[in-house]
Interface confidence: low
C-alpha cells in the first residue's frame, strides 16, 4: 500500500474535511518543482517568486540578479534566454500558442553590458522560434517559415532559406504531424556544439491533404482553420536535412545531408539529429512502416564542403515483433571518443536496455539487463553514466536514478535515489550541469514532491531547492484518499493497477467503481506519483473507488506486453480493463451495479469500446475527445501501431476497430460523449461520426461540445467539463447532490 508519507494526521477527526470540486478546479493543492537553468558546471539561473532572474553559484554560495523584474515588466516578458557569452538576454513576450509545443512570440534583446535594449536591426514579429548559438551570441530564428541568422544581436540578419510558405514549406520548424508525433518540439534546427554549423529540417507539405474546421470566434462568419494533416494512409510530408556553415553562410550555402539508400527506397521519416562534434553529426531515419530505423553518422568533408555519410557508419535497428523503439526511437548519447555511443533498445529477452555501440549494432555490449527497463540516459561523462529505470523492488511505475561507473572495469552500478526518501520519493527525474559536476533531483511522489541539489561526484545532497511546505500545511486538515499500487496475474499477463480508496474505506462495504483509462501504446498510468486531482475528489468526497489499470500495450514492462497490441489496437487494451474490473468485483467491496469508465483521447476510445463490449459490466461511461476510427488519426502515430489502411495490409482491422461499428452495443449503457470543436489533434469528426452512428442505430446518449476548444479543453471549459462529468457520474451512481 502506498500511503501519502507526508500527510500529518490530526487526532481530531472533525477538523478534517474532504476535498471539494472547487479545490480541484482552483488548483488549491498544486505542487511546485525546481529545475535549475544550468549555465555552467556550477552555475544556474532561476526566476525568483518576484520575477527577478537570479544567477546562483553553487561553489561560492553567492547569488546575484542579472535581470530585474522591472526590465522584464517593461516588455511584459514571460520568458528569457541568456546568451552563452553572458552579454545578452532575449526576452519573450506576446506568447501566442499554436499547437502542443509551438507558439509565436515577440523577442527583445537586452544588452547586459550597458543595461539597454539593443536598438537597430530589431527582430521581426511574431517569431516562430529563436535560439542562441551554444557559444558566443549568434542568433538563429524562424520567421514566416524561413530561417535567419545574426552574427551579433545588433547585426542585420542573413536569410538562410527563401522557400518558406505557410502550410506548404516549413524551414527550421516542424509541420503539424512532425511536431506532435515525431520530434515533440517546436523547433527543427540544431546548432553544432561550438556554433560553427547550423543544421535544419525542411518539411514540404505541398501534397498533404488538409483538415479544415470552423473556428466560430465572435465575428459574423466563422473562420476556417486549415492544417496539412496526413491521416492514416495519406500522403506524408517530404523531409530534407540541410547544414550551413554559420561563419561564412554565403560561401557555399546550405548543404543537404544524404539519406541512407535503404531508407530512401520508399516513404520515410527523419526522426532526430544529434551533433557529435562540430564536424560530425548523427541523423536518425525511419521507414514509413516503422519497424526499421537507421542511425547514420556523417562527417564534414573540408575539401568538398559537403557532408559524407559512409555506409560503414550506418547502424540499423529493426523490430521483428512490433515497431522500432518505444513511443519514439531512442536517441544516442555519444561518448568522448566521438564515435561510440550508448543507446536504449530491446535486448534478446525483449526488455529495453542500455547498449554500448562501438562498431556495429550486432556487436553491441549490453550495459544493463534484467526483467525491467532502462528508461532514459541522462548524461555520460568520462567515468559515469547516469540513467533512470524501474528496476528497484520490481515496481514498473517507479523511476530511480542510477550511476554506472564506466571508467572502471567491471563497471559498477549504484542507485543514487533508491534510499534517499524511500517512502516519500519513488519517482524521480534529474537535471545535470556541465560535466555532471552537480545535478538536481526532482521527486514527483508518491509523497509531496521535493526538488534537491546534489554533488555530481559524491551524490551528497547540498540543499533543498523546493519542498512544497505550503502544500504540506494546506493538506494537514484534508481527508485525502488512500492509494494502493498492486498487481493482478491473469493468464500469464501482469496487470498493474492503482486503486484510489475513500478515506474511511471499509472492505466490508460496497462502493461504486470508476475506471480511469488511457491505455495508449507505450503509455503508463500506474505511476508512483503525487496528485490531488478530480479522481482524488471523487474518492474523498463522493466515496467512489477509482482504479487505473495498465494492460497490454502499455510501457516499461517488456516487449511482450508492449507489442501485444501491434496491428490490432482496440482489442487487448479493452479486454484487460474488463478483466481487471471482474477481478475488482471478486475483491468483494465493489457494487457490481455501479461501475463506470472514463477516458480522454486514446482513453476515450478505450472507454467507448469497453462500454460497447456487451459485457454488461458498466452502467455508464464518459469519452472525452475520443478517437473513433484509426482512419481519422495522424499517419505517423497510427501507422506505427496499425500498419496501413490498405486491403493488402491492415484495412480489415482498421474497419473492425471503430467505435461506430459497435453503435448497437451502447443501448444498455449511459454514454456521455464530449469533444472540443477546434481540436487540431483528434478532430471533432471522430465524435461527429460516433454521434451519427448512435442516432442511426436509434441509441440514446448524452453529449457536450466545447466551442472553439482544442484537445486540452482548457480555461473555463475545464471547470465546465469536470462539473458536467461530476453530475453525470453522481446521477449514474445515484449519489445525492
Amino acid at each position: 500500500i502506498v500511503l501519502r508519507p507526508s500527510r500529518v494526521h490530526n487526532s481530531e477527526e472533525n477538523t478534517m474535511r474532504a476535498l471539494t470540486l472547487k479545490d480541484i478546479l482552483n488548483g488549491t493543492f498544486s505542487y511546485k518543482t525546481f529545475f535549475p537553468n544550468w549555465i555552467s558546471g556550477q552555475e544556474y539561473l532561476h526566476q525568483s517568486a518576484d520575477n527577478n532572474i537570479v544567477l546562483y553559484n553553487i561553489e561560492t554560495g553567492q547569488s546575484y540578479t542579472i535581470l530585474s523584474n522591472r526590465t522584464m515588466k517593461s516588455v511584459n516578458a514571460s520568458n528569457y534566454g541568456l546568451s552563452p557569452d553572458r552579454q545578452f538576454v532575449y526576452l519573450e513576450s506576446d506568447y501566442s500558442k499554436l499547437w502542443r509545443y509551438s507558439y509565436t512570440a515577440t523577442y527583445y534583446i537586452y544588452d547586459l553590458s550597458n543595461g539597454e535594449f539593443v536598438r537597430g536591426n530589431e527582430l521581426p514579429r511574431p517569431i516562430q522560434y529563436l535560439c542562441w548559438s551554444p557559444v558566443g551570441s549568434k542568433l538563429a530564428y524562424v520567421y514566416q517559415n524561413n530561417i535567419y541568422l545574426k552574427q551579433r544581436p545588433g547585426d542585420p540578419p542573413f536569410q538562410i532559406t527563401f522557400n518558406g510558405r505557410e502550410n506548404k514549406i516549413f524551414n527550421g520548424i516542424p509541420d503539424w504531424v512532425y511536431e506532435e508525433e515525431m520530434l515533440a518540439t517546436k523547433y527543427a534546427l540544431w546548432w553544432s556544439p561550438n556554433g560553427k554549423f547550423l543544421a535544419y529540417a525542411e518539411f514540404n507539405d505541398t501534397d498533404i491533404p488538409v483538415i479544415a474546421y470552423s473556428y466560430y470566434g465572435d465575428e459574423q462568419y466563422p473562420r476556417t482553420i486549415n492544417i496539412p494533416y496526413p491521416k492514416a494512409g495519406a500522403k506524408n510530408p517530404v523531409v530534407r536535412i540541410f547544414i550551413i556553415d554559420t561563419t561564412y553562410p554565403a560561401y557555399v550555402g546550405p548543404q543537404e545531408v544524404p539519406v541512407p539508400a535503404m531508407i530512401a527506397s520508399s516513404d520515410y521519416y527523419f526522426s532526430w539529429l544529434t551533433w557529435v562534434t562540430d564536424e560530425r553529426v548523427c541523423l536518425q531515419w525511419l521507414k514509413r512502416v516503422q519497424n526499421v530505423s537507421v542511425l547514420s553518422i556523417c562527417d564534414f568533408r573540408e575539401d568538398w564542403q559537403t557532408w559524407d555519410c559512409p555506409k560503414t557508419q550506418e547502424h540499423i535497428e529493426e523490430s521483428r515483433t512490433g515497431w522500432a523503439g518505444g513511443f519514439f526511437v531512442s536517441t544516442p548519447v555519444f561518448s568522448y571518443d566521438a564515435i561510440s555511443y550508448y543507446k536504449i533498445f530491446s535486448d534478446k529477452d525483449g526488455y529495453k536496455h542500455i547498449h554500448y555501440i562501438k562498431d556495429t549494432v550486432e556487436n553491441a555490449i549490453q550495459i544493463t539487463s534484467g526483467k525491467w527497463e532502462a528508461i532514459n540516459i541522462f548524461r555520460v561523462t568520462q567515468d559515469s553514466l547516469f540513467y533512470s529505470s524501474n528496476e528497484f523492488e520490481e515496481y514498473p511505475g517507479r523511476r530511480n536514478i542510477y550511476r554506472i561507473s564506466i571508467g572502471s572495469y567491471p563497471p559498477s552500478k549504484k542507485c543514487v535515489t533508491c534510499h534517499l526518501r524511500k517512502e516519500r520519493c519513488q519517482y524521480y527525474t534529474a537535471s545535470f550541469s556541465d560535466y555532471a559536476k552537480y545535478y538536481a533531483l526532482v521527486c514527483y511522489g508518491p509523497g509531496i514532491p521535493i526538488s534537491t541539489l546534489h554533488d555530481g561526484r559524491t551524490d551528497q545532497e547540498i540543499k533543498i531547492l523546493e519542498e512544497n511546505k505550503e502544500l504540506e500545511n494546506a493538506l494537514k486538515n484534508i481527508q485525502l484518499p488512500k492509494e494502493e499500487i498492486k498487481k493482478l496475474e491473469v493468464d500469464e499477463i501482469t496487470l498493474w493497477y492503482k486503486m484510489i480508496l475513500p478515506p474511511q474505506f471499509d472492505r466490508s462495504k460496497k462502493y461504486p467503481l470508476l475506471i480511469q483509462v488511457y491505455g495508449g501504446p507505450c503509455s503508463q498510468s500506474v505511476r508512483s506519483v503525487f496528485a490531488v486531482n478530480w479522481i482524488s475528489y471523487l474518492a474523498s468526497k463522493e466515496g467512489m473507488v477509482i482504479a487505473l489499470v495498465d494492460g497490454r500495450g502499455t510501457a516499461f514492462q517488456g516487449d511482450k506486453l508492449l507489442y501485444a497490441v501491434y496491428r490490432k489496437l482496440g482489442v487487448y487494451e479493452v479486454e484487460d480493463q474488463i478483466t481487471a474490473v471482474r477481478k475488482f468485483i471478486e475483491m468483494g467491496f465493489i457494487d457490481e451495479k455501479r461501475i463506470a469508465i472514463w477516458g480522454w483521447s486514446y482513453g476515450g476510445y478505450v472507454s467507448s469500446l469497453a462500454l460497447a463490449s456487451g459485457t454488461g459490466l458498466f452502467k455508464c461511461g464518459i469519452a472525452v475527445a475520443p478517437v473513433s476510427s484509426w482512419e481519422y488519426y495522424a499517419s505517423v502515430y497510427t501507422e506505427r501501431f496499425m500498419g496501413l489502411p490498405t486491403k493488402d495490409d491492415n484495412l480489415e482491422h482498421y474497419k473492425n476497430s471503430t467505435v461506430m461499428a459497435r453503435a448497437e452495443y451502447f443501448r444498455n449503457v449511459d454514454y456521455l460523449l464530449i469533444h472540443g470543436t477546434a481540436d487540431d489533434n483528434v478532430h471533432f469528426q471522430n465524435s461527429a461520426q460516433i454521434a451519427k452512428a448512435l442516432v442511426n442505430a436509434q441509441v440514446d446518449f448524452q453529449a457536450m461540445w466545447y466551442s472553439d476548444q482544442n484537445h486540452g479543453l482548457s480555461g473555463l471549459s475545464t471547470n465546465h467539463l469536470y462539473t458536467h462529468m461530476t453530475h453525470f457520474l453522481k446521477q449514474c451512481f445515484s449519489l445525492s447532490d
Partner: nanobody
Framework: QVQLQESGGGLVQAGGSLSVSCAAS?????MGWFRQAPGKQRELVAA???????NYADSVKGRFTISRDNAKNTVYLQMKSLKPEDTAVYYC???????????????????WGQGTQVTVSS
C-alpha cells in the same frame, strides 16, 4: 436469430488428429471455437473472419487450423498432434462484429452452438 450446428469431435489417442465443423444459419462476420474443460473457464481456441483473418490461442498455434467456407457459412477446425490437455467440450461461436475474433472472453460473443465433446486419451 442465428443458429449454429456443430458436428465432429469424439475420442482420439494422444498425438492423433480430429476435426470439428460448424454451420451457421445466416451469414456472419466472425466465427470461432471455444473450449471448456471440467471446472475451467470457457477459453478461445481459434477464430476467423469472413475475410479469412485468423486468431489462435498460443496453446494451439501450429497444431490447430481454422478455416471457413463463406458460401456454406461453415467454419472448420482441424486439430493435429492432440494432447490430453486438449480434452474439453468444444463450442462453436459466432458474432456479427469482425473485431470479435480477438475477444477471448466468451461473454463477448453473441451466438453459440450446443457443444461437442473432444476426448484425448493418453
Amino acid at each position: 436469430q442465428v443458429q449454429l450446428q456443430e458436428s465432429g469431435g469424439g475420442l482420439v489417442q494422444a498425438g492423433g488428429s480430429l476435426s470439428v465443423s460448424c454451420a451457421a444459419s445466416g451469414s456472419i462476420f466472425s466465427m470461432g471455437w471455444f473450449r471448456q474443460a471440467p471446472g475451467k473457464q470457457r477459453e478461445l481456441v481459434a477464430a476467423v473472419t469472413s475475410g479469412g483473418v485468423t486468431n489462435y490461442a498460443d496453446s494451439v498455434k501450429g497444431r490447430f487450423t481454422i478455416s471457413r467456407d463463406n458460401a456454406k457459412n461453415t467454419v472448420y477446425l482441424q486439430m493435429k498432434s492432440l494432447k490430453p490437455e486438449d480434452t474439453a467440450v468444444y463450442y462453436c461461436a459466432a458474432d456479427s462484429s469482425r473485431g470479435k475474433i480477438y475477444f477471448s472472453n466468451y461473454r463477448s460473443w453473441n451466438y453459440w452452438g450446443q457443444g461437442t465433446q473432444v476426448t484425448v486419451s493418453s
